[in-house]
């Protein structure tokens, strides 16, 4: 009778996470008697996966019917595979012994690799908004994938970006991996409607990449432009001055009118007009009773946008019974001291 051989026909098996893995093993003889055991890994630290003789192994089923009397097939199936199950599995024949069974012969081993899908990419932008012409960073993260090979691309409005850096961790062997990428994006005034996309391709995705998105509207702040003008009025003792606040984003805006440096009225922008590029416009007006003023008046439109330092523009309103000409406007940062009439 030829000596028993342990045959593991497959050097490697690849299984998708969540599926069952079948590990094949056959004996060439029924003799010598003794249990078949399956281990993950070799040496002293090996992990028992299945023992034919005894024990409870809820995830393991035998491929061949256990009650076959001449069974030489000791293949097993492991259910609900996770990346943690990856490793080399050995089918080991033990010879009956006293008091303990003795390892007799081992199969060559079957390497189980687990294909695990990456998690949905999560894209996050900068913590604070930036203005056009500045560069902001977006990060993309995905976890839990295996094998390690993965491709990540960045797009802005469908155009591929090149300024990014990507790391896959850990660098060595692991049951699963994570990817982290940072892209640098230069903001433009038209980016309120723009979107950045992080696209991940992996063998488990079968050509259908995962995408994570972020809107640049969360990252951009477009400061407003101000224009103060006087509108014609029928009544000679009244002047109508308007402040046109244009092309700002986001919405949050507070406007204060000052007459010769003194606060006349404060209002919060409510009914805004949205432009095609996603920015907003707003207009505020101020009625000035010219009779109440002997001298010329400097009217200042002061705007605080998105919690930033206020910007303002002033308009010199000439008080003259016969003259209705408009004064020049002046732009200032922050609060303005009263402006002398032009």
């Amino acid at each position: 009778e030829d000596e028993l051989q342990v045959i593991q026909p497959e050097k490697s098996v690849s299984v998708a996470a969540g599926e069952s893995a079948t590990l094949r093993c056959a004996m060439t003889s029924l003799i010598p008697v003794g249990p078949i055991m399956w281990f993950r890994g070799a040496g002293a630290g090996r992990e028992l996966i299945y023992n034919q003789k005894e024990g409870h192994f809820p995830r393991v089923t035998t491929v061949s019917e256990l009650t076959k009397r001449n069974n030489l097939d000791f293949s097993i199936s492991i259910s609900n595979i996770t990346p943690a199950d990856a490793g080399t599995y050995y089918c080991v024949k033990f010879r009956k012994g006293s008091p303990d069974d003795v390892e007799f012969k081992s199969g060559a081993g079957t390497e189980l690799s687990v294909r695990a899908k990456p998690s949905a990419p999560v894209v996050s932008g900068p913590a604070v908004r930036a203005t056009p012409e500045h560069t902001v960073s977006f990060t993309c993260e995905s976890h839990g994938f295996s094998p390690r090979d993965i491709t990540l691309k960045w797009f802005k409005n469908g155009n591929e970006l090149s300024d990014f850096q990507t790391n896959v961790d850990p660098a060595g062997d692991s049951v699963s991996y994570s990817i982290h990428s940072t892209a640098r994006v230069v903001l433009t005034r038209g980016d309120v409607h723009s979107q950045v996309i992080c696209e991940i391709a992996h063998i488990t995705l079968q050509g259908d990449p995962l995408r994570g998105t972020a809107n640049l509207s969360e990252a951009i702040r477009v400061p407003p432009t101000l224009e103060v003008t006087q509108q014609p009025m029928r009544a000679e003792n009244q002047a109508n001055v308007t402040c046109q606040v244009s092309n700002f984003y986001p919405r949050g805006l507070q406007l204060t009118w000052l007459e010769n440096g003194n606060v006349s009225r404060t209002e919060t922008a409510s009914t805004l007009i949205e432009n095609k590029d996603g920015t907003y416009n707003w207009m505020s007006w101020l009625l000035v009773n010219t009779c109440a003023h002997r001298d010329d008046v400097v009217l200042t439109c002061q705007v605080e946008h998105d919690g930033q330092q206020a910007v303002s523009k002033s308009y010199a309103l000439e008080i003259s019974a016969h003259q209705k000409e408009h004064g020049s406007d002046i732009t200032h940062e922050a609060a303005l001291a009263p402006t002398a009439p032009l």
């Epitope: 010598p32 008697v33 034919q52 005894e54 019917e65 256990l66 009650t67 001449n70 009956k96 006293s98």
Partner: antibody
């Protein structure tokens, strides 16, 4: 309590047929292989045939191969042995025996036996 | 085909130790089982996997198996142990029995 109860034995002429039954109770019948073992008068035990728990695998001693057929009905927890072309040397008490499990099982339970006599 | 050989008979005095042997080629590489059969009764399993006793079998029954020989040992033999004993190789598709040994308690 495990119980195995054979029936169907009797006197039959050479060349005739008999069907033995073994009604099982007290265990999950489909989880165990079952066997027929016979014992001729004044002689030792002779294994005849075995069947796996599902019924998918059957085994026979050379002395009965081609003449006997083992089968089981797991829904009825019953084991059968169809014996055709009976010969005088098939005369014996036929025991139904349960395998003890999946790891080198002995016969851990036996029925009381049913006598088959083949004689003209 | 595989064959197992047993002595036809063994005699022992009450209280003494009885040993029944079972020989087969490299039997030590296989598992041996032993059955006890009293007259007019069905066989009863007394030893399996060489040395193990099923529940209900007295401790005086023990087994060993190495080389070409398996041995059933009954220590402190009692009159009720008088019976036929059969060895079996519990490892293959065909269950091979020995010819049986009649144990007489004198």
């Amino acid at each position: 309590e495990v119980q195995l109860l054979e029936s169907g034995g009797g006197l039959v002429q050479p060349g005739g047929s008999l069907r033995l039954s073994c009604a099982a109770s007290g265990f999950t019948f489909s989880s165990y292989a079952m066997s027929w073992v016979r014992q001729a008068p004044g002689k030792g035990l002779e294994w005849v045939s075995a069947i796996s728990g599902s019924g998918g695998d059957t085994y026979y001693a050379d002395s009965v191969k081609g003449r006997f057929t083992i089968s089981r009905d797991n829904s009825k927890s019953t084991l059968y042995l169809q014996m055709n072309s009976l010969r005088a040397e098939d005369t014996a008490v036929y025991y139904c025996a349960k395998d003890g499990g999946s790891y080198y099982p002995p016969f851990d339970y036996w029925g009381q036996g049913t006598l088959v006599t083949v004689s003209s | 085909s595989y064959e197992l050989t047993q002595p036809p008979s063994v005699s022992v005095s009450p209280g003494q130790t009885a040993s029944i042997t079972c020989s087969g080629d490299k039997l030590g590489d296989r598992y041996a089982c032993w059955y006890q059969q009293k007259p007019g009764q069905s066989p009863v399993l007394v030893i399996y996997q060489d040395t193990k006793r099923p529940s209900g079998i007295p401790e005086r029954f023990s087994g060993s198996n190495s080389g070409n020989t398996a041995t059933l040992t009954i220590s402190g033999t009692q009159a009720m142990d008088e019976a036929d004993y059969y060895c079996q190789a519990c490892d293959s598709s065909t269950a091979v029995f020995g010819g049986g040994t009649k144990l007489t308690v004198l």
